[in-house]
Interface confidence: low
């Protein structure tokens, strides 16, 4: 039966390193004669770079090396025969067997990655993230897919804003450079990029990096037509309501990044609720086309809202939006109405009186404290009725005299706000007049329905 | 930056009179409302009234109308409220604040004046 | 006038914890005109939450406001020892008032 015995050595080890044992078995006494063995080695194929790279302890079967020139990357594997003799080796008397052991050289990194060219090349369009821009090829003579062959790229030059990273494709060793954060070419043209190569692990010792593990990387920006953005955006200003049709507000422009592209920007409306405005689509100026009015539903806590679309003539077109806020002061255009519209007394002044409070879409100061009063004429109304401010927001109406038939008043009331000039309006005051009970409340309701208009009298 | 100063405290004898002062800087003086508010010691903020620079309008509430006096120097961008008749009731920290532009939120305001009475 | 009723009138919360006050109008405030400030001993009141939900500058946002009509609150999601302090509500929706305040104390 012919014995095969395996052993593993590193590439690269020392003379005298110990690799493996063989062992042959005699069924005669080991102490005798007949028992005891001696081994050598018969042959060493291949014979490269020695015929004899490694020794065997004849008494023992240790197998050492006893040249230098390991190396896995020319020689992977070893194949000895070795002879076992008893009668001490003698080769006249004792009987002989051969074995054979395989010695597999395992690879050291002793080879460092090299790139396949001094300079790469690549593009990129501005903007854009996650896009692989060259890729980086390597050679290393050592074993495929291990940590000695596998390569680590790192960028040590040229992107001192941490705008690249190279990752390594698992498959091909490749380098593959991609863009992390997005490049303005208005900013940066082009980025020269120094790369360097190493292994997952250490070299061996005494093995240095040659030249050719950097390598530069040579990135072109690509010019892409951007978006033109409007500055400050959204733009505020202040300006009073009540402005007349055709006042030229504001300018609002955009600025287009694209300093080396020769284009033009027009301006047009996106959102303007209440339709108060217009944009020149050349320069930006920004024209009102109606009242401006503060009070408008579409005005929100004093805010009016516009946006605008700044639009390029690139290709393709590219467009920015803007928002213009338009903080409107009040101006006193209101006058201030009387609430309720409607109310109810009793015949006689006793037990009540009407509350009445002031309505004004302006705001301080253009609204309260308010003054009430009534009219002189007819002359029925102040000699029926009695109006009393109890603050600047609210008056109570009474009946003035000691009994008023059942039936419909109108009763106008001027009311006039703090405005600087300010504004007065005459509020019609419906008051049905009724008879009560002893808790003020209306008693005959039906009768009261068909009766007549009364002018306060 | 929006500031409003008000002067400094003051100790002031029963049935006299004082006036504090609140000067307001970093913003245009006539286009907001100064407001006065009182706060007597460890109680709640009480309401006293406005004063419009843009055109000299004033209001008060109801509770303090006879007791308070609004007036303005424009020139020296600067509120002032005058308390008549004083007595133990009117000690109190005062202070002046700015109406926002929205709302009526009062988003500015003075550090406060302390006024005590006593005799 | 408007009468600002707020509750509790004194209250004390655990760091972390869930605070929420409230704030009743005696007749109905728009939102618009519904105020919180924040006051602390011996400084002036500082605007903390206008037009019911909105957070005043350097506000952190564990604070939130809500409500319509004539029910409003201030909610604080996880309480710190910072947010110990009395806070007003306020309408400028009728004349002006102010609540009589609800002072946060840290338990």
């Known amino acids: 039966l012919h014995q095969v015995w395996n052993g593993t050595v590193p590439e690269g080890s020392k003379p005298g390193t110990y690799v493996m044992t063989v062992t042959a078995i005699d069924a005669d006494d080991p102490n005798a004669l007949n028992g005891m063995l001696r081994y050598r080695i018969v042959s060493q194929a291949p014979s490269t770079p020695s015929p004899n790279m490694f020794t065997i302890n004849n008494e023992t079967g240790d197998i050492i090396t006893v040249a230098a020139g390991l190396d896995r990357e020319k020689v992977q594997q070893y194949t000895l025969i070795i002879q076992a003799t008893d009668m001490e080796g003698n080769p006249t008397y004792g009987l002989s067997n051969t074995a054979t052991a395989v010695i597999t050289v395992t690879d050291v990194n002793d080879n460092p990655p090299e790139f396949t060219a001094m300079t790469f090349y690549g593009e990129v369009p501005e903007n854009r993230v996650d896009i692989i821009v060259a890729n980086l090829t390597v050679t290393d003579k050592d074993q495929p897919h291990t940590p000695a062959w596998n390569a680590v790229y790192r960028i040590s030059g040229g992107d001192p804003t941490g705008r690249f990273a190279i990752q390594t494709d698992p498959n091909s060793n490749d380098g593959l450079v991609t863009v992390v954060k997005p490049i303005d070419f208005e900013t940066n043209r082009m980025f020269v990029l120094t790369v360097a190569a190493e292994n997952q692990v250490p070299l061996a010792k005494g093995i240095q990096h040659p030249p050719q593990s950097t390598a530069t990387v040579s990135v072109t920006v690509i010019d892409v037509n951007e978006n033109p953005y409007f500055a400050p955006n959204p733009k505020i200003i202040r300006q009073e309501e009540g402005l007349h049709a055709g006042t030229m507000l504001t300018t609002f422009t955009a600025q287009d990044p694209d300093r080396y592209m020769q284009q033009n920007i027009r301006y047009t409306k996106l959102s303007d609720p209440a339709n108060w405005l217009k944009i020149d689509p050349v320069n930006g100026q920004i024209t009102t086309i109606a009242v401006l009015d503060r009070e408008s539903p579409n005005v929100k806590n004093n805010i009016y809202n516009a946006t605008f679309l700044a639009s390029d003539n690139g290709i393709p077109p590219m467009s920015g939006t803007g928002t213009l806020q338009i903080y409107l002061l009040d101006i006193n255009d209101n006058a201030p109405q009387v609430l309720p519209q409607e109310a109810e007394t009793c015949e006689t002044p006793d037990p009540n009186s009407i509350n009445i409070t002031a309505l004004d879409y302006d705001i301080d100061p253009n609204a309260g404290p308010f003054a009430f009063d009534l009219p002189l004429s007819p002359v029925t109304i102040k000699r029926n009725w009695t109006i009393t401010r109890l603050n600047g927001d609210f008056a109570q109406l009474n009946l003035k005299i000691k009994f008023l038939e059942a039936g419909i008043y109108e009763v106008p009331i001027i009311i006039t706000d703090s405005g600087n000039p300010p504004k007065s309006n005459i509020s019609i005051l419906r008051v049905k007049v009724c008879q009560c009970d002893s808790n003020g409340d209306c008693t005959d309701v039906d009768r009261i329905v068909g009766a007549g208009l009364g002018t306060g009298a | 930056q929006v500031q409003l100063q008000q002067s400094g405290a003051e100790l002031v004898k029963p049935g006299a009179s004082v006036k504090l002062s609140c000067k307001a800087s970093?913003?245009?003086?006539?286009?907001?409302?100064i407001q006065w508010v009182k706060q007597r010691s460890g109680q709640g903020l009480e309401w006293i009234g406005w004063f419009y620079p843009g055109s000299g309008s004033i209001k008060y509430n109801e509770k303090f109308k006879d007791k308070a006096t609004l007036t303005a120097d424009k020139s020296s961008n600067t509120v002032y409220m005058e308390i008549s008749r004083l007595t133990s009731e009117d000690s109190a920290v005062y202070f002046c604040?700015?109406?926002?532009?929205?709302?009526?939120?009062?988003?500015?305001w003075g550090q406060g004046t302390t006024l005590t009475v006593s005799s | 006038q408007i009468v600002l009723t707020q509750s509790p009138a004194i209250m004390s919360a655990s760091l972390g914890e869930r605070v929420t006050m409230t704030c009743t109008a005696s007749s109905s405030v728009s939102s618009s005109y519904l105020h919180w400030y924040q006051q602390k001993p011996g400084s002036s009141p500082k605007l903390w939450i206008f037009?019911?939900?909105n957070l005043a500058s350097g506000v952190p946002d564990r604070f939130s406001g809500s409500g319509s009509g004539t029910s409003y609150s201030l909610t604080i999601n996880s309480m710190e020892a910072e947010d110990a302090a009395t806070y007003y509500c306020h309408q400028y929706h009728r004349s002006l008032t102010f609540g009589a305040g609800t002072k946060l104390e840290l338990k």
């Open positions: 037009s019911t939900s």
């Open positions: 604040a700015r109406r926002g532009d929205w709302g009526g939120f009062f988003d500015y």
């Open positions: 970093g913003f245009t003086f006539t286009d907001y409302l």
